[in-house]
């Protein structure tokens, strides 16, 4: 069955970054318009994005009410100035979108360096821990938190004055490497979750940080350079 | 390991009622919609019906829509379906079965067997 | 209702046989088929979702293939235990299954 001169949605594509997740699809609409609903294998349906004339429908407030559970949406089109009748049975013509589990799907996004210290030989770097839109409480959660163990960060680092790169890796957002001294260093980062065996396993490399600019403080030469 | 266990068929006379019951153990019920699926005697499968986790949408095929009602209690991981108005062509094997999405069955009972006949 | 139509309705093989069964839906479910067996007396097993996901636990001799309107399932070689009826379903809109396929030794 379907509604007169309403074509199916297609291409249900998830877009989903550090949990931030929207359901995309075609065509563009003429004379039609979309509602999404969205539901885990539970089957208790929830419709989004009422009669809208987008190919997109933010479904990040769902998804985020447990992020390890698989989800599935479908797409309904409608004719354009559809007003709900109860007395309607015809069903419309609908498409449902592949699977999604967030915890295992979403991409991880571009890390930030958020400082480096230097004392001695030693530099620290610390990795911004980015917010999600996960709760627990009322409360919003990082991607630490969230990922737990599971999260994974690896430094690139190597001297301004080379280009042979060097790699540490960490479970927390903070490393402690070797340098030499008077040497200025770059860095680099990358988040991973080594579970996974997808190409989402890994975030794109963080801007590069050097020793020398403003990102981080060096006790060794007296420059102090305190992040935002 | 996931089991459904279905109960309650037997023989009725046509124009009368039967509740069938299903029990489930193994997993979350309440995280799965849940169906009930027969099978007539040296026939093939026939959808009957089908229930959300929550039991706050219900699906039924038009052969038995207005005669039958599927329901569950989660709080004892049971799913219901009250058949009223029998006819000798509900004859059948009845198989619950797990639903994800309601869209497929990934696991079924054993079936129990409902007779309509005076 | 979408109605969907299997074939052959009975198939005779041997062990080590490929065998295919094929499924046709009067309008286009994409992917949205399941294929199962069913033994006498049985209850049906899942072996097949989303036209060509193989369940957990079956074995990889089973594929499914197809989308829009066309599917098949394959055995790549018919053991002993792969007599029985085997039955599509479409959940595209509802449910609907397909009248079987009985396969059975020749």
């Known amino acids: 069955s379907g509604t007169t001169n309403t074509v199916a949605a297609y291409n249900l594509t998830w877009k989903s970054t550090n949990f931030k997740t929207i359901l995309e699809w075609e065509p563009k609409p003429i004379n039609q318009v979309y509602t999404v609903q969205i539901s885990t294998k539970s089957g208790d349906w929830k419709s989004k994005c009422f009669y809208t004339a987008d190919t997109e429908c933010d479904l990040t407030d769902e998804i985020v009410k447990d992020v390890k559970q698989t989800y599935l949406a479908r797409v309904f089109s409608y004719p354009a100035g559809h007003v709900e009748s109860t007395g309607s049975t015809e069903e419309p013509p609908y498409e449902n979108s592949p699977e999604f589990t967030p915890y295992l799907e979403t991409n991880l996004g571009q890390p930030t360096i958020q400082s480096f210290e230097q004392v001695g030989t030693k530099v620290n770097v610390t990795v911004q821990d980015e917010w999600t839109l996960v709760r627990r409480n009322d409360t919003f959660l990082s991607l630490r938190d969230v990922f737990g163990k599971d999260l994974i960060y690896t430094l690139y680092y190597w001297k301004s004055s080379s280009s042979g790169k060097k790699t540490a890796k960490t479970n927390t957002n903070e490393f402690l490497i070797d340098v030499d001294k008077g040497e200025n260093y770059c860095f680099s980062v990358q988040a991973v979750i080594p579970s996974r065996r997808t190409a989402n396993r890994k975030s794109t490399d963080s801007p590069v940080e050097c020793m020398g600019h403003e990102k981080g403080e060096s006790r060794e030469t007296g420059h102090h350079h305190h992040h935002h | 390991e996931v089991q459904l266990l279905e109960s309650g068929g037997g023989l009725v006379q046509p124009g009368g009622s039967l509740r069938l019951s299903c029990a489930a153990s193994g997993f979350t019920f309440s995280s799965y919609a849940m169906a009930w699926v027969r099978q007539a005697p040296g026939k093939g499968l026939e959808w009957v019906s089908a229930?959300?986790?929550?039991?706050?949408?219900?699906y039924y095929a038009d052969s038995v829509k207005g005669r039958f009602t599927i329901s569950r209690d989660n709080s004892k991981n049971t799913l219901y379906l009250q058949m009223n108005s029998l006819r000798a062509e509900d004859t059948a094997v009845y198989y619950c079965?797990?639903?994800?999405?309601?869209?497929?069955?990934?696991?079924w009972g054993k079936g129990t067997t409902v007779t309509v006949s005076s | 209702d979408i109605q969907m139509t299997q074939s052959p309705s009975t198939l005779s093989a041997s062990v080590g046989d490929r065998v295919t069964i094929t499924c046709r839906a009067s309008?286009?479910?994409?992917?949205?088929l399941a294929w199962y067996q069913q033994k006498p007396g049985k209850a049906p097993k899942l072996l097949i979702y989303?036209?060509?996901s193989l369940e957990s636990g079956v074995p990889s001799r089973f594929s499914g293939s197809g989308s829009g309107t066309e599917f098949t399932l394959t055995i790549s070689s018919l053991q002993p235990d792969d007599f029985a009826t085997y039955y599509c379903q479409q959940y595209k809109s509802y449910i609907t299954f397909g009248g079987g396929t009985k396969v059975e030794i020749k």
């Open positions: 309008q286009s479910i994409s992917s949205w």
């Open positions: 989303k036209a060509s």
């Open positions: 079965a797990k639903a994800p999405y309601g869209y497929y069955m990934d696991v």
């Open positions: 229930i959300s986790g929550s039991g706050g949408l219900t």
